[in-house]
């Protein structure tokens, strides 16, 4: 069964910066990745980035840079410009659309006791929606 993993990490050098890493474990080719925060895409979450292997990428503030790391994983850099960090308690969700499997989504967040530079373990809290 395909699986999506999500890691959220706080940057050691910049406490207001976070990076979300997501990956797809399974066969098939990725046709689209959507990253959202505050909940799943289409279910109360706010779209942060979309990545397409051919059409390119788009991101919306507070996301700063979305990029492919491998053919089946992405990273999204976020910058919290506010004085207090809303990211610390926020859920980030990644949805991978793949052919022929359909869509698979999983969510994760920064661990409560995170030290800068440490990342959350892979979190298959999968909302396994095969759309």
């Amino acid at each position: 069964t395909p699986e999506v993993w999500v890691q959220v990490q706080m940057e050691a050098t910049e406490l207001s910066s976070f990076t979300v890493h997501c990956g797809f474990l399974g066969p098939g080719s990725i046709s689209l990745v959507t990253v959202s925060w505050g909940g799943p895409d289409g279910a109360g979450g706010t779209k942060l980035a979309v990545l397409h292997p051919e059409l390119g990428t788009r991101q919306w503030a507070p996301a700063r840079q979305a990029r492919w790391e491998t053919q089946s994983s992405i990273s999204l850099a976020l910058e919290d410009s506010g004085a207090s960090s809303p990211f610390a308690n926020t859920t980030f969700c990644c949805k991978f659309a793949s052919f022929p499997e359909g869509s698979w989504e999983s969510c994760g967040s920064l661990p409560p006791s995170s030290d800068p530079g440490l990342s959350a373990p892979p979190t298959p809290v999968p909302i396994l929606r095969a759309d």
Partner: antibody
Framework: QVHLQQSGPELVKPGASLKISCKAS????????LNWVKQRPGQGLEWIGW????????FYNEKFKGKATLTVDKSSSTAYMLLNSLTSEDSAVYFC????????????WGQGTTLTVSS | DIQLTQSPSSLSASLGGKVTITCKAS??????IAWCQHKPGKGPRLLIH???TLHPGIPSRFSGSGSGRDYSFSISNLEPEDSATYYC????????FGGGTKLEIK
């Protein structure tokens, strides 16, 4: 066919508030960011802010924080912009515009709402 | 905030000719630049996004290029209906418009 229909022209007195509407059709309203843009007479375009209708999350240009408030009514696929404490500086044409994501920013625009603030 | 300096602010060109407008960003905007056409009394129209990608339905007379901080936009085989104000727009982080270029066709 994507269409953004804005409310009609308004003449209001200084100090008043006004809510402008933008009714979206032809696409899934909750899937795309909706932006508002200001154009003063004889001037260029200024981005006011955006709202993501699916979550009602907003992001404002610093210049318009406290001046504009963006909201949506998902049931009617309508976006609203409330402008408060109006002055002559707020006299302008206001546009709503959809962010098309990978299709590019501002891929569809409303026809504009003309606001005149005068006593 | 990212600033965009657009030039020229106005220009006049002949029917059938070619014009080029430039836009310089205050920092690298990673090709996230778009170009819009605006005619009085109407909503603006997206022509190009991601530096050089034509929006559906836009003729190939319109083109864009550039990278880093420097971008340009051209219209060839000018037609009467190209008379309008053109704006560049960066969307690398938030959104900022250039000052606009008013084009008159003679």
């Amino acid at each position: 066919q994507v269409h953004l229909q804005q409310s009609g022209p308004e003449l209001v007195k200084p100090g008043a508030s006004l809510k402008i509407s933008c009714k979206a059709s032809g696409y899934t309203f909750t899937d795309y960011y909706l932006n508002w843009v200001k154009q003063r007479p004889g001037q260029g375009l200024e981005w006011i802010g955006w709202i993501f209708p699916g979550s009602e999350s907003t992001f404002y240009n610093e210049k318009f924080k406290g001046k504009a408030t963006l909201t949506v009514d998902k049931s009617s696929s309508t976006a609203y912009m409330l402008l408060n404490s109006l002055t002559s500086e707020d006299s302008a044409v206001y546009f709503c515009t959809r962010d098309g994501g990978l299709r590019g920013p501002f891929d569809y625009w409303g026809q504009g709402t003309t606001l005149t603030v005068s006593s | 905030d990212i600033q965009l300096t657009q030039s020229p602010s106005s220009l006049s060109a002949s029917l059938g000719g070619k014009v080029t407008i430039t836009c310089k960003a205050s920092q690298d905007i990673n090709k996230y630049i778009a170009w819009c056409q605006h005619k009085p009394g109407k909503g603006p129209r997206l022509l190009i996004h991601y530096t050089s990608t034509l929006h559906p339905g836009i003729p190939s007379r319109f083109s864009g290029s550039g990278s880093g901080r420097d971008y340009s936009f051209s219209i060839s085989n000018l037609e009467p209906e190209d008379s309008a104000t053109y704006y560049c727009l960066q969307y690398d982080y938030l959104l900022t418009f250039g000052g606009g270029t008013k084009l008159e066709i003679k």
